[in-house]
Interface confidence: medium
């Protein structure tokens, strides 16, 4: 009678994470009597996966659970596969005895696990930056296998080219991680822009995963200021407006100064939004020119998003006409809130 052979017909098996792997093994004879054991890896450090004779292996089932004794199929199924299960599995025949002794091993089956990458997480800089500055975005995805993966960056649908990507670890591993850093130049129109990191992997069946970052959380568009003077019906009053345009985010505080002295401070509330996502706001000051003998320097000072203040000044000429002299007050008006200061 020919000597028993242990046959593992599959050199390799590829299984998706979460699924069940079937590892096939047959013997050519029932002699010698003795159990089959399955191991992952070879040598003294090999890991016991299944022992026919004894032990509890909750994830392992035999393919033929309760079959006829003439059958010599020792195939097993391992449920709920994870990347940690990857490796070479050996079906080993033992000869019955006290103790059982190893008789013959199969050639081994390499189990490769396909694991999906995690949803990409995109993060931007910790502090806001202004247009024309270059900012870095990072994208991370973990837990995928095999190692081959494609990562692309987009800004508003346009592919970016200035990025650097690493896949770790470099050597063999049960699963891998990808880390990419992209450089993006900000423009004033980027409040509504999105940066997208797209990851394509064999496990995703052509449907890549995407992570996004809104540039609204990264950009700061500083305001432009314009101070203008309009006459009003009352000949001794002048309306001075400060147009605060194209700023983002909304957090803004405005202070009026008359000849360097604080006249009023207010916080932007009723703003108007532009198509590009930036905001406009206007504040005005009703100046009673008859209260002033000399020219007045009016300054609109704006502190935007905690940044150093920017300001714009306007020189108000005072003409000494008798009919314009009288009242000793300057009236200030912002919208419907009018108050006189004495």
């Amino acid at each position: 009678e020919e000597e028993l052979q242990v046959i593992q017909p599959d050199k390799s098996v590829l299984v998706a994470a979460g699924e069940t792997a079937t590892l096939r093994c047959t013997a050519t004879s029932l002699i010698p009597v003795g159990p089959i054991q399955w191991f992952r890896g070879a040598g003294p450090a090999r890991e016991l996966i299944y022992n026919q004779k004894e032990g509890h292996f909750p994830r392992v089932t035999t393919v033929s659970e309760s079959t006829k004794r003439e059958n010599m199929d020792f195939s097993i199924s391992i449920s709920n596969i994870t990347p940690a299960d990857a490796g070479t599995y050996y079906c080993v025949k033992f000869r019955k005895g006290s103790p059982d002794t190893e008789f013959k091993s199969g050639a081994g089956t390499e189990l490769s696990v396909r694991a999906k990458p995690s949803a990409p997480v995109v993060s931007g800089p910790a502090a806001r930056a202004t247009p024309q500055h270059t900012v870095s975005f990072t994208c991370e995805s973990h837990g995928f296998s095999p190692r081959d993966i494609t990562l692309k960056w987009f800004k508003n649908g346009n592919e970016l080219s200035d990025f650097q990507t690493n896949v770790d670890p470099v050597g063999e591993s049960v699963s891998y991680s990808i880390h990419s850093t992209a450089k993006v130049v900000l423009t004033r129109e980027d409040v509504h822009s999105q940066v997208i990191c797209e990851v394509a992997h064999v496990t995703l069946q052509g449907d890549p995963l995407r992570g996004t970052a809104n540039l609204s959380e990264t950009i700061r568009v500083p305001p432009t200021l314009e101070v203008t003077q309009q006459p009003v019906r009352a000949e001794n009053q002048v309306n001075v407006t400060c147009q605060v345009r194209k700023f983002y985010p909304q957090r803004l505080q405005l202070t009026w100064l008359e000849n360097g002295n604080v006249s009023r401070t207010e916080t932007a509330s009723t703003v108007t939004e532009n198509k590009d996502g930036t905001y406009n706001w206007m504040s005005w000051l009703l100046v009673n020119v008859s209260a002033h003998r000399d020219d007045v320097k009016l300054t609109c000072q704006v502190e935007h998003d905690g940044q150093p203040a920017v300001s714009k000044s306007h020189d108000l000429k005072v003409s000494a006409h008798p009919k314009e002299q009288g009242s000793n007050t300057a009236a200030e008006n912002t919208g419907s809130n009018e108050r006189n200061i004495y």
Epitope: L30, Q52, K53, E54, R69
Partner: antibody
Framework: QVQLKESGPGLVQPSETLSLTCTVS????????LSWVRQPSGKGPEWMGR???????AYNSALKSRLSISRDTSKNQVFLKMNSLQTDDTGTYYC??????????????????WGPGTMVTVSS | QFTLTQPKSVSGALRSTITIPCERS????????VSWYQRHLGRPPINVIY?????PSEVSDRFSGSIDSSSNSASLTITNLQMDDEADYFC?????????FGGGTKLTVL
């Protein structure tokens, strides 16, 4: 839990046919094989035959000519028919659940659950 | 086809150790596995050892099985003998496609 119960006539006339039924619960006949084992009074047990999980049968060659085992999986029942009974067929008849030693294709079977047995007397 | 021979009876004192042999008539005892069963009067048999030396989880560790190639026999050993161990014990093995039982041993606890 796993249970097996034999039923049938306690007394059979010589030369007649014995019909026994084994009703099981707690497992599926599609997954486990069942054997019939008898123990004549004052002797050791004797394996009679097996109904495999897939419907095939195997018989003890000494009894094969007069033994037939069948099943009805929908009723969870396995049947034994043995003809031409003689007085030395008297004894306790058990149905047993078979277990492959390692829960897989391996040539060692043992009997992990037994029914209480039914006493069969062959007498005129 | 071989036979399995057991002594008709064995006795042992309470809390002692006894061994029940099961001799194979022909062929090597190592060519097939041996199982052991216990049967109390009026109760169905239960499996106490399978595969020569494997014990089902619900069976007391006082029960152990072994094989001895020099005597071509298998043995069931019961330590710390209890009154409830008094029962019939029989061994079982197989040859080709047939299961073979020993004649059974009556254990008496003194």
């Amino acid at each position: 839990q796993v249970q097996l119960k034999e039923s049938g006539p306690g007394l059979v006339q010589p030369s007649e046919t014995l019909s026994l039924t084994c009703t099981v619960s707690g497992f599926s006949l599609a997954s486990y094989s069942l054997s019939w084992v008898r123990q004549p009074s004052g002797k050791g047990p004797e394996w009679m035959g097996r109904m495999y999980y897939d419907g095939d049968t195997a018989y003890n060659s000494a009894l094969k000519s007069r033994l037939s085992i069948s099943r009805d999986t929908s009723k969870n029942q396995v049947f034994l028919k043995m003809n031409s009974l003689q007085t030395d067929d008297t004894g306790t008849y058990y149905c047993t659940r078979d277990r492959s030693m390692f829960g897989t294709d391996y040539p060692h079977w043992y009997f992990d659950f037994w029914g209480p047995g039914t006493m069969v007397t062959v007498s005129s | 086809q071989f036979t399995l021979t057991q002594p008709k009876s064995v006795s042992g004192a309470l809390r002692s150790t006894i061994t029940i042999p099961c001799e194979r008539s022909s062929g090597d005892i190592g060519d097939s596995y041996v199982s052991w069963y216990q049967r109390h009067l009026g109760r169905p048999p239960i499996n106490v050892i399978y595969a020569d030396d494997q014990r089902p989880s619900e069976v007391s560790d006082r029960f152990s099985g072994s094989i001895d190639s020099s005597s071509n026999s298998a043995s069931l050993t019961i330590t710390n003998l209890q009154m409830d161990d008094e029962a019939d014990y029989f061994c079982q093995s197989y040859d080709s496609k047939i299961d073979i039982f020993g004649g059974g041993t009556k254990l008496t606890v003194l």
